[in-house]
């Protein structure tokens, strides 16, 4: 504690001020990270702020334009690709959102040999998606649905597949299920390392059923949008696995990769695809009741001209207390023998931790062990293996950067990050060059986060690649909340959670508690992370008390607190936020009259369900576009944590996990409903079932609703929601406004 | 359409060698694999091994490893058997033939046959 | 290596009548795909002529009274109605593993 002259104090008190609802809405004390484009070992492609792309030498220290500015401003782009022979760049403009990851763009070619954009043969437009091969310069892209080669930018295309049909046939690129609950990609297509074959998949949507709404628009009829999305239960899509040479694309055509029997015997998914060499291949399936996935390693016959996936090199994970793997079934990273690989899945402790095979499953190595958990591999080299963790000082939401030596024997392991900037710098991200010689660390909080370049051999931090020095700046004069990550412990299950106080908070006196709630499976909400946002506001210029809490069902803390709520969602994760509260009120500072919760998406489920739990804790509480129904949500991740909704399988707790079956439970608070209309992932439809519930219970509740808007409510739809909860929270807390 | 023609017949003596060539047209001759099969005389079908002109990729029987080399020539379209250090039992008819892009290893067109006859 | 014995031996028929040749695996030529089993007809002094690949396709230009079935160890070369051209030694062939092997070949003479 530094003790200073009063009057200083004083001066430095008067200059200090709160944040404001306006610095968060414009985004004031946003943050930058820096993420290199690596090309090589040593080299990396930046946009710098003047937007040019500049290649950067780490070993020579210099740096020069590829692409100036001027050639981006001529087609408006917005993002680039250097092709690896470095002859090309695609630029990419006209950028419209489609899904969460999806988008449709203009693609124009620019060749650097001659500075000019190559003409003939150019690209169709709108392109769904567009990618370089990993060497030279051919472009594979997805057009209306299918696909199509170059073997050079200015040679005319082959089309691969023909069968692509909108919301019927997907080839290379996911349907909404796919891309939103399985992939996490825009794309469905493949190179191998040095883009002898293509693989990509193709999605059969013809049989699931359409959600279907109205976009308002501005004309006089509203348009009706229309996507195959099966909810849970629902028929899926069909996916098959096709490779083609690209050398010959036209000799054989596309080769289906045969689906292990064990999988294809009834309904399945293709989980991810993973090249090994150019002529081997790693794909993972999984069965549509998700608690068994196979990873099939498959082999290019140059005779049969197709792949041959022999049981031997099939690899099964099962999962006897939950689903599969944490959110996703981990994939595999291979050894430079293109044989073994490195894993991460649970041990017989029940901890997701990174395991070696070589040749079955049931002999795996075990590489990493603890009551804590790996979380990532990043890289695997010959002689190490990079991996982020949450071991360190034993906090869940922390994440550092690991390095274990796989040449030699006995692998010693070595903590790169926990060290360098320990009270900055807790939760960690890397980036590696090609065979790991360099790295980018990316440090996201506690403190203020900031980018650096390391040395692969020595980890030596080489410079600082950015610093949010205007950001630390512009803080200087802020009163910040204070920030704790604590537990607590109650029947045996260790709840973590994340308190943002007032800057003069005072343990002697009484705070209104607001809880910031998601829940989901597989999720983890109480992170060593830096954020200036609502609920900051909310506690440095309302004086409110914030508390994130990680419940059952979260992750990275073993299987037993993960696997809690499978095939009962809706119970914990709403009894451990309770308990949370009950806690909170012990402590002494809490107003127990003026306590809130509030949750987007899952957390909207959660909230609205301990509003309605009947403890009377909870004075008033806000839902944004939440789930009401598991039979309203997506099959793909429904089904994950909660089985069929089937008589035989688990209808019942589908049907008691509603909000509307506590419909009357409402009658005693105040509840705040928003969604957007034109949601395509929780659909509107979850919240109008809720209105219908509560009108006819005759329940007095609010509402808003944001006119074609979508599961983010964004633009200036985020402006009225943050403007509009902070009322609704400031009224419930008798707050002035 | 596809043809594949083979070199004349051949008279060796034991420990000699022969090369026998197999000229493609009709078809890319990069794209396909071409096989070479032996038939000795009143005898069934053996599969001596394969190479693949546009990946320069072989596979050889294991009891001919080492006395076997197979190669190719782009420019002519030609591909070549060579075998060392004959013996008697090499005498047979030998074939070469084109690998069926979707035949899954089946052998679509065959050369009419090289009759190599090893006797001292 | 896999081993594929061809039976009968010989088979002895008459012009019009059906022919049934069967080929045997020591071991599975078969993947969930597709069966690895080619068959081919030779007649003397003059190449094999693949007839089916992959168990069941008959390849173009050949006849409709050729068919092919069977998976796993077990194939079969069906010939519906025997033609007085049709009389020659038939070999199957695996493509499963390298090598590749043939039978020892049936030899449908005519009765």
């Known amino acids: 504690i530094v003790l200073r002259p009063s009057r200083v104090h004083n001066s430095e008190e008067n200059t200090m001020r709160a944040l404001t609802l306006k610095d968060i809405l414009n985004g004031t004390f946003s943050y930058k990270t820096f993420f290199p484009n690596w090309i090589s070992g040593q080299e990396y492609l930046h946009q710098s702020a003047d937007n040019n792309i500049v290649l950067y030498n780490i070993e020579t220290g210099q740096s020069y334009t590829i692409l100036s500015n001027r050639t981006m401003k001529s087609v408006n782009a917005s993002n680039y690709g250097l092709s690896p022979d470095r002859q090309f760049v695609y630029l990419e403009s006209d950028y419209s959102k489609l899904w969460r990851y999806s988008y449709t763009a203009t693609y124009y070619i620019y060749d650097l040999s001659n500075g000019e954009f190559v003409r003939g043969n150019e690209l169709p437009r709108p392109i769904q998606y567009l990618c370089w091969s990993p060497v030279g310069s051919k472009l594979a892209y997805v057009y209306q649905n299918n696909i199509y080669l170059k073997q050079r930018p200015g040679d005319p295309p082959f089309q691969i597949t023909f069968n692509g049909r909108e919301n019927k046939i997907f080839n290379g690129i996911p349907d909404w299920v796919y891309e939103e609950e399985m992939l996490a990609t825009k794309y469905a297509l493949w190179w191998s390392p040095n883009g002898k074959f293509l693989a990509y998949a193709e999605f059969n949507d013809t049989d699931i059923p359409v959600i279907a709404y109205s976009y308002y628009g501005d004309e006089q009829y509203p348009r009706t949008i229309n996507i195959p999305y099966p909810k849970a239960g629902a028929k899926n899509p069909v996916v098959r696995i096709f490779i083609i040479d690209t050398t010959y694309p036209a000799y054989v055509g596309p080769q289906e990769v045969p689906v292990p029997a064990m999988i294809a015997s009834s309904d399945y998914y293709f989980s991810w695809l993973t090249w090994v060499t150019d002529e081997r291949v790693c794909l993972q399936w999984l069965k549509r009741v998700q608690n068994v996935s196979v990873l099939s390693i498959c082999d290019f016959r140059e005779d049969w001209q197709t792949w041959d996936c022999p049981k031997t090199q099939e690899h099964i994970e099962e999962s006897r207390t939950g689903w599969a793997g944490g959110f996703f079934v981990s994939t595999p990273v291979f050894s430079y023998d293109a044989i073994s690989y490195y894993k991460i899945f649970s041990d017989k402790d029940g901890y997701k931790h990174i395991h070696y095979i070589k040749d079955t499953v049931e002999n795996a190595i075990q590489i990493t062990s603890g009551k804590w958990e790996a979380i990532n591999i990043f890289r695997v080299t010959q002689d190490s293996l990079f991996y982020s963790s949450n071991e360190f000082e034993e906090y869940p939401g922390r994440r550092n950067i690991y390095r274990i030596s796989i040449g030699s024997y006995p692998p010693s392991k070595k903590c790169v990050t926990c060290h360098l900037r320990k009270e900055r710098c807790q939760y960690y991200t890397a980036s590696f060059s090609d065979y790991a010689k360099y790295y980018a660390l990316v440090c996201y909080g506690p403190g203020i986060p900031i980018s650096t370049l390391h040395d692969g051999r020595t980890d030596q931090e080489i410079k600082i690649l950015e610093e949010n020095k205007e950001l630390e700046n512009a803080l200087k004069n802020i009163q910040l909340p204070k920030e704790e990550i604590k537990k607590l412990e109650v029947d045996e299950i260790t709840l973590w959670y994340k308190m943002i106080l007032p800057p003069q908070f005072d343990r002697s006196k009484k705070y209104p508690l607001l809880i910031q709630v998601y829940g989901g499976p597989c999720s983890q909400s109480v992170r060593s992370v830096f954020a200036v946002n609502w609920i900051s506001y909310l506690a440095s210029k309302e004086g409110m008390v914030i508390a994130l809490v990680d419940g059952r069902g979260t992750a990275f803390q073993g299987d037993k607190l993960l696997y809690a709520v499978y095939r009962k969602l809706g119970v914990y994760e709403v009894e451990d936020q309770i308990t949370a509260v009950r806690k909170f009120i012990e402590m002494g500072f809490i107003d127990e009259k003026r306590i809130a919760i509030w949750g987007w998406s899952y957390g909207g489920y959660v909230s609205s369900l301990a509003l309605a739990s009947g403890t009377g804790l909870f004075k008033c509480g806000i839902a944004v576009a939440p789930v009401s129904s598991w039979e309203y949500y997506a099959s793909v991740y429904t089904e994950r944590f909660m089985g069929l909704p089937t008589k035989d399988d688990n209808l019942e707790h589908y049907k008691n996990s509603t909000v509307m079956a506590r419909a009357e439970y409402f009658r005693n608070v105040d509840y705040l409903l928003i969604h957007g209309t034109a949601d395509d992932n929780v659909h509107f439809q979850n919240s109008a079932q809720i209105a219908k519930a509560l009108v006819n219970a005759q329940v007095d509740f609010q509402a808003m609703w944001y006119s074609d808007q979508n599961h983010g409510l964004s633009g200036l739809s985020t402006n009225h929601l943050y403007t509009h909860m902070t009322h609704f929270l400031k009224q419930c807390f008798s707050l002035s406004d | 359409q596809v043809q594949l023609v083979q070199s004349g017949a051949e008279v060796k003596k034991p420990g000699a060698s022969v090369k026998v060539s197999c000229k493609a047209s009709g078809y890319t001759f990069t794209e396909a694999i071409i096989h070479w099969v032996r038939q000795a005389p009143g005898q069934g079908l053996e599969w001596m091994g394969w190479?693949?002109?546009?990946?320069?990729?072989?596979k050889y029987a294991q009891k001919l490893q080492g006395r076997v080399t197979m190669t190719t020539d782009t420019s002519t379209s030609t591909a070549y058997m060579e075998l060392r250090s004959l013996r008697s039992d090499d005498t047979a008819v030998y074939y070469c033939?084109?690998?069926?892009?979707?035949?899954?290893?089946?052998?679509?067109?065959w050369g009419q046959g090289t009759l190599v006859t090893v006797s001292s | 290596e896999i081993v594929l014995t061809q039976s009968p031996g010989t088979l002895s028929l008459s012009p019009g009548e059906r022919a049934t040749l069967s080929c045997r695996a020591s071991q599975s030529v078969s993947t969930s795909a597709y069966s690895y089993m080619h068959w081919y007809q030779q007649k003397p002094g003059q190449a094999p002529r693949l007839l089916i690949y992959?168990?069941?396709n008959l390849e173009s230009g050949i006849p409709d009274r050729f068919s092919g079935s069977g998976s796993g160890t077990d194939f079969t070369l069906t010939i519906s109605r025997l033609e007085p051209e049709d009389f020659a030694v038939y070999y199957c062939?695996?493509?499963?593993?390298?090598?590749?092997?043939f039978g020892q070949g049936t030899k449908l003479e005519i009765k």
């Open positions: 033939a084109r690998h069926g892009g979707t035949g899954r290893g089946a052998m679509d067109y």
């Open positions: 992959a168990a069941s």
């Open positions: 062939q695996q493509s499963r593993e390298l090598p590749y092997t």
């Open positions: 190479i693949h002109p546009g990946s320069g990729s072989i």
